[in-house]
Interface confidence: medium
């Protein structure tokens, strides 16, 4: 921001009323009035260019320093070209000297040169040549000097003429302040510029009403330079929750709008399924029946639990069931839907029912499912099963009601045995199998059926209570088709896959485990 100038002395604005002291009295410097742009202007002028050595002084009135540390002196003046006078005026000069003196009191008309310290020789950039003078073209020069640090109550300026033809049209003395500033929603007070050019005064800012320093953020600070300019802003303030930035202030969110945290963002319109908010709201309450999960941002619409899975099927495959369903028709406005599958088994004879989580196996964990199908295995035969699929989302935990669909299935067969070839020779095949442990108690015997591949007219059957059998009297180097089926009190269980096993050829005789 541009520096603020506090004027201590302004000759041009005083309309010739200041009454500065001239020395020697009545000679040299003289107060004159002229007309420029149809306006009367006053100037202190001297033009003793033909009179040899000159030492004419013009001293200002005493200027109270106040809070100024460094003063700036702006001079507007005109100097005539020495060559514009007849004979070139051999003693003519084209510069004058600027002095100052500090004091704690006004010396009045007591003028003492020795008290004054020279600031600089003032030379014009442009001199007024004859043609300009005749044409009333005033070649105005502007020079600025600064002095500091000042320590006394006040000061004088003085102008020494050494034989120039010069007119002082404006003498303006001022000091600089960094102006009161609102930046980054922080208020910085008007601050006096320091006196030393390299130094920057650090100034702490205060957050405007309803603004705060964000957590972990830096307190607002700026630096006031010697020229009255604010530099190097550090930190900032943000409008607190419920308020937004409007120009350089924080304004409460309008009704129907909210802002949930201190940030640079504006207030947002209340999302769907919320009640109209009052002025300055930090959030918008949910409509009845709608909820906001703890992790939901305030900008998200309020949501509700989903409806039940839309369509559920249970397809039995031996001692396995594949459950399939479609997503709920009403998601509740959320995308974080998960499914939970629970299982209940009932004994047909007694009608007794109980949970079956411990006795069945799921293709993936049955809680927090994101897919819409699951396979349940290790089911017991001749048992009734009821499966419940519940749809849940992030707000389901906020209500007591549940959204689920059920499907029932009766298991009439055991699961097909899993068959392995344990060993073989030229004339025998050793075969083993397994079924899920929960089903083993219901199996009476296992029936092993085998025949030569390609021979559909004859087959052999062996029954056993164990989980393995060795098939003897087989032809060497021959492929046999083998199937195992569990037999229960209620009838046959599901048959295994038909496996192709080959006996060894005579050359590779001996019992070889596979």
């Amino acid at each position: 921001a541009q520096g603020k100038e506090v004027v201590l002395l302004d000759f041009a604005a005083a309309g010739g009323e200041l009454g500065w002291l001239t020395h020697p009295y009545g000679k040299g410097w003289d107060l004159m009035q002229n007309i420029m742009n149809d306006m009367p202007i006053y100037m202190y002028s001297v033009c003793n260019v033909m009179s040899g050595d000159q030492d004419n002084w013009l001293r200002t009135n005493w200027v109270y320093r106040g809070e100024a540390e460094r003063i700036f002196i702006e001079l507007k003046f005109t100097v005539r070209d020495c060559n514009s006078f007849p004979g070139g005026a051999s003693s003519c000069k084209e510069t004058f000297n600027l002095y100052y003196a500090e004091s704690d009191l006004d010396y009045g008309t007591n003028f003492q040169k020795r008290l004054f310290t020279k600031i600089d020789t003032i030379a014009p950039d442009e001199i007024t040549v004859s043609s300009d003078f005749e044409a009333r073209h005033v070649k105005l020069n502007v020079e600025e000097r600064s002095v500091g640090p000042l320590t006394r109550k006040g000061f004088y300026l003085a102008f020494q003429d050494i034989g120039a033809c010069v007119a002082l049209l404006s003498v303006r003395v001022y000091y600089k302040k960094c102006p009161e500033l609102l930046q980054g929603l922080a208020h910085f007070p008007e601050t006096i510029a320091g006196s030393d050019a390299p130094s920057l005064a650090t100034v702490a800012g205060t957050c405007v009403d309803h603004a705060v320093v964000p957590p972990g953020g830096e307190e607002p600070r700026m630096h006031c330079a010697v020229d009255g300019e604010w530099l190097v802003p550090i930190g900032q303030c943000l409008c607190q929750a419920g308020y937004e930035k409007v120009e350089d202030a924080c304004q409460a969110c309008s009704p129907g709008f909210f802002k949930f945290e201190a940030s640079e963002s504006p207030c947002l319109e209340c999302p769907e399924h919320t009640l109209p908010s009052p002025e300055g709201a930090t959030s918008c309450e949910c409509e009845e029946g709608f909820f906001r999960a703890p992790q939901d941002p305030a900008s998200m619409p309020c949501t509700r639990p989903p409806s039940a899975p839309h369509y559920l099927t249970a397809v039995g495959m031996g001692a396995k069931v594949e459950l399939r369903w479609t997503p709920p028709q009403d998601s509740g406005g959320r995308e974080d839907i998960v499914y939970s599958v629970t299982c209940e088994q009932c004994w047909p004879e007694s009608g007794e029912c109980g949970p079956c989580e411990a006795s069945v196996r799921y293709s993936e964990p049955p809680h927090g499912l994101t897919r819409t199908s699951v396979t349940v295995s290790d089911l017991e035969p001749h048992m009734n099963y009821t499966f419940t699929v519940e749809a849940r989302n992030g707000v389901s935990g906020l209500v007591t009601s549940r959204s689920f669909r059920t499907a029932s299935v009766s298991i009439n067969q055991t699961e097909p045995p899993k068959v392995r070839l344990e060993g073989r020779s030229t004339t025998s095949l050793s075969v083993s199998w397994s079924i899920p442990p929960p089903q083993q108690s219901r199996v009476w015997k296992y029936e092993v059926t085998y025949r030569k591949k390609g021979d559909s007219n004859s087959y052999n059957v062996r029954r056993t209570e164990g989980f393995s059998v060795t098939l003897d009297d087989l032809a060497p180097d021959t492929t046999y088709l083998v199937q195992v089926q569990a037999l229960t009190q209620e009838g046959q269980g599901a048959g295994s896959k038909v496996h192709e096993f080959q006996t060894l050829s005579p050359e590779g005789s001996g019992n070889l485990a596979v």
Epitope: M32, N34, I35, V49, S84, F85, S130, F133, E134
Partner: antibody
Framework: EVQLLESGGGLVQPGGSLRLSCAAS????????MAWVRQAPGKGLEWVSR????????HYADSVKGRFTISRDNSKNTLYLQMNSLRAEDTAVYYC?????????????????????WGQGTLVTVSS | DIQMTQSPSSLSASVGDRVTITCRAS??????LAWYQQKPGKAPKLLIY???NLHTGVPSRFSGSGSGTEFSLTISGLQPDDFATYYC?????????FGQGTKVEIK
């Protein structure tokens, strides 16, 4: 020595025209502002017109504006006053006068000029 | 236009007298004032410019003073050559105007 010599005056009828000349010598004519000042018989002095050193700007008294034209020829060191639509009240001795700012020991020129050097004048009589 | 009023319009004085002529401007003209001397049948001569500055070659018995609206020309010891008519002229405004003149006669 500065010399200014007017010529061209005489008797002229109302509504007539006349051209006055002023021949300058003894100074650098092109450095001087030049002017015409008149004096009616038995009356005081009245400024008529002025012209800058290089031919501009020009100014006129309200009483002659639009009828008189001031001009100069620096190569001939001569000042002119063309007078048209002459009236009886224009009867006067017409002086040419000059001002050189080099002799004016002030830092800022006065808004207008005074007259350092004068010619002897030429009489213009407007009568029927 | 700025009006210039001289007083008196005429005065009688003896050689050696101190004579003062005044000139009043209708508005402030700072120090932009000149004084001229004119003898019958002759052209005016510049005496003083900028209210108080003596023109080259003018005797020092002539002096000028004043600023704003009140000005005066003083002849400190009247000489026979000084009997003439004296005019003031303002040059603050481009329509430079003269006073009506003050005639100084021998008593």
């Amino acid at each position: 020595e500065v010399q200014l010599l007017e010529s061209g005056g005489g008797l002229v009828q109302p509504g007539g025209s006349l051209r006055l000349s002023c021949a300058a010598s003894g100074f650098t004519f092109s450095h001087y502002m030049m002017a015409w000042v008149r004096q009616a018989p038995g009356k005081g002095l009245e400024w008529v017109s002025r012209i800058g050193p290089s031919g501009g700007p020009t100014h006129y008294a309200d009483s002659v504006k639009g009828r008189f034209t001031i001009s100069r020829d620096n190569s001939k060191n001569t000042l002119y006053l063309q007078m048209n639509s002459l009236r009886a009240e224009d009867t006067a001795v017409y002086y040419c006068a000059g001002y050189d700012s080099g002799y004016d020991y002030v830092a800022v020129a006065g808004p207008a000029e005074y007259f350092q050097h004068w010619g002897q004048g030429t009489l213009v009589t407007v009568s029927s | 236009d700025i009006q210039m009023t001289q007083s008196p319009s005429s005065l009688s004085a003896s050689v050696g007298d101190r004579v003062t002529i005044t000139c009043r401007a209708s508005q402030s003209i700072s120090t932009w004032l000149a004084w001229y001397q004119q003898k019958p049948g002759k052209a005016p001569k510049l005496l003083i410019y900028k209210a108080s500055n003596l023109h080259t070659g003018v005797p020092s018995r002539f002096s000028g003073s004043g600023s704003g609206t009140e000005f005066s020309l003083t002849i400190s010891g009247l000489q026979p050559d000084d009997f003439a008519t004296y005019y003031c002229q303002q040059y603050q405004s481009y329509s430079r105007t003269f006073g009506q003149g003050t005639k100084v006669e021998i008593k």
